[in-house]
Interface confidence: low
Amino acid sequence: EKLPKAPVITTPLETVDALVEEVATFMCAVESYPQPEISWTRNKILIKLFDTRYSIRENGQLLTILSVEDSDDGIYCCTANNGVGGAVESCGALQVKMKPKITRPPINVKIIEGLKAVLPCTTMGNPKPSVSWIKGDSALRENSRIAVLESGSLRIHNVQKEDAGQYRCVAKNSLGTAYSKLVKLEVEVFARILRAPESHNVTFGSFVTLRCTAIGMPVPTISWIENGNAVSSGSIQENVKDRVIDSRLQLFITKPGLYTCIATNKHGEKFSTAKAAATVSIAEWSKSQKESKGYCAQYRGEVCDAVLVKDSLVFFNTSYPDPEEAQELLIHTAWNELKAVSPLCRPAAEALLCNHLFQECSPGVLPTPMPICREYCLAVKELFCAKEWLAMEGKTHRGLYRSGMHFLPVPECSKLPSMHQDPTACTRLPYLDYKKENITTFPSITSSKPSVDIPNLPASTSSFAVSPAYSMT
């Protein structure tokens, strides 16, 4: 009869390398009498005999993992016990080897030039895969802007136009290589004007071509503005090549103007725009133009900026050597004189003087200034500035103000066109339209009785006689 013998493990467990989905086997050969009970643990947790992922054979000496998963990685131990002596144990590691797998592949990206782009590429594998990137057909080199992060993602700082293209990431270890699908990095570039239109000084009736070139991604659209409004006449030719748009506006010049080229492109829900402007001035006026004694142009001064209608054309009198400068100087001088008048009078007088010195202008073959409507002139003279006007009439019969060399005539109201006869032939003063709704007291006038009132006022505000010819409604 055999003598009892304590268990001895004759083949200690070794480290086992296994690929995912392959079979892995641990051998735990035991010599003992009587036959031992052999149990298995993974990371100190007992493996149950009925677990279908495992096969335990040869009286428990052989543990087979039927289809290895990456979660099977760990320390496996066999323990043998037959009641004689102590239990014995041997342990070995299972290293699950895994070909590279891209778990979060890169996706198509649209990014605005100058911002930061990150293309993801998260991988799995054992040994840990190294990640590299391919742009187009070539390996991508890292530099101060371009880096492959620890996670495998590609980060591009301060994205440039040349970064646009097709990218893929490559995950590689000793067991194999995995490639992501190709993704596209699109770099959107704010609209920018490469070539601004040039200003021209031409003769009346000339043809002029204004050229504006812009770049952007997507390719910008170009629109043209003439004196603040969409160009009403002229032909536009456009040519697009390599993200650059070239727009040419051909004009027949009958008046000076400010022409603005506006390049626009869209980035998601937002737009970017770039603007460039050029002036077209008329050098030699034809006979008919000379007879008009002036031209229409946008007001570019500062004194009347708040008074004149924004972006409207005003009349410049060519009897002055430099009309814009001269008229600005006249109004500047008048402005200083107006500091002395009453708060009621001053804004009305400013509106009157600005609209008289810079009259609204109808362009065309013969530029025509549009005088102030008689009713508005009389409202300033006899209502808003009655006291001041009377005081000045003692000094001069033709104007309000005298300053240094400059005598500033105000219009003779009686000679102005009435808005009732032809509303399109004269200019209204918007300030007075607004003010008539807000005036509650007028200066008392004892020396003369005005011939005009602003209608629709509360009954208590005025007892002036109303002449229907001068009514402003």
């Epitope: 920018r192 725009t273 500062e302 004194v303 600005e328 500047h332």
Partner: antibody, heavy 121, light 112 residues
Framework: EVQLLESGGGLVQPGGSLRLSCAAS????????MSWVRQAPGKGLEWVSA????????YYKESVKGRFTISRDNSKNTLYLQMNSLRAEDTAVYYC??????????????WGQGTLVTVSS | QTVVTQEPSFSVSPGGTVTLTCGLS?????????PDWYQQTPGQAPRTLIY???SRHSGVPDRFSGSILGNKAALTITGAQADDESDYYC????????????FGGGTKLTVL
């Protein structure tokens, strides 16, 4: 050659006044906007005030509004900055600078050498 | 209150390229801010380099260029030279409420 020469700086007590002048030459002064820019010792540039070619409007940094007045005399080719109610924080080199065009806010394309204003008791 | 931001300092190797930026504390810098760039060496008056985003001032070498990158104005110096070591300021036209002109805090550029 464009030349801008500032003068009028010096030591003044808090609450006091100074008037800076800038004499311009080498260009048609009346055709250009002008500005004053200052720089506190060891600090950066700070825009103070601007005036267009004809002087009709004036523009100021918020902290100097009501205390400083910019003006120009085109006949004398001179720009001025009247500084009242001076404070210690107004201590700086004050530069006169020419704008690139008539408007008050074109680029600053020519600079003087600066004049030092020290506000201290 | 318009605050214009610049990198306090930057360094570049001789012959290298550097891009200085100029941003707004709230919102983006656009061509409507007409970004201007100025260079100042210690003890000297500023000198204009770039105006209205990308126009080079007369006499300025073409190593200096201006642009808008994303939401900031940028000054790029290519082929940096020892005498480019200076303070660089950007200036922006601001029109929030009232017209004014605001300088950034400046960037001290060191050419190593």
């Amino acid at each position: 050659e464009v030349q801008l020469l500032e003068s009028g700086g010096g030591l003044v007590q808090p609450g006091g006044s100074l008037r800076l002048s800038c004499a311009a030459s080498g260009f048609t002064f009346s055709d250009y906007g002008m500005s004053w820019v200052r720089q506190a010792p060891g600090k950066g540039l700070e825009w103070v005030s601007a005036i267009p070619w004809q002087g009709g409007s004036t523009y100021y940094k918020e902290s100097v509004k009501g205390r400083f007045t910019i003006s120009r005399d085109n006949s004398k080719n001179t720009l001025y900055l009247q500084m009242n109610s001076l404070r210690a924080e107004d201590t700086a080199v004050y530069y006169c600078a020419k704008r690139s065009g008539r408007i008050a806010f074109g680029a600053l394309d020519a600079w003087g050498q600066g004049t030092l204003v020290t506000v201290s008791s | 209150q318009t605050v214009v931001t610049q990198e306090p300092s930057f360094s570049v190797s001789p012959g290298g390229t550097v891009t200085l930026t100029c941003g707004l504390s709230s919102g983006s810098v656009t061509s409507s801010n007409y970004p201007d760039w100025y260079q100042q060496t210690p003890g000297q008056a500023p000198r204009t380099l770039i105006y209205s985003t990308d126009s080079r001032h007369s006499g300025v070498p073409d190593r200096f260029s201006g642009s808008i990158l994303g939401n900031k104005a940028a000054l790029t110096i290519t082929g940096a030279q020892a005498d480019d070591e200076s303070d660089y300021y950007c200036g922006l036209y601001s029109y929030s409420g009232s017209k004014n002109y605001v300088f950034g805090g400046g960037t001290k550029l060191t050419v190593l």
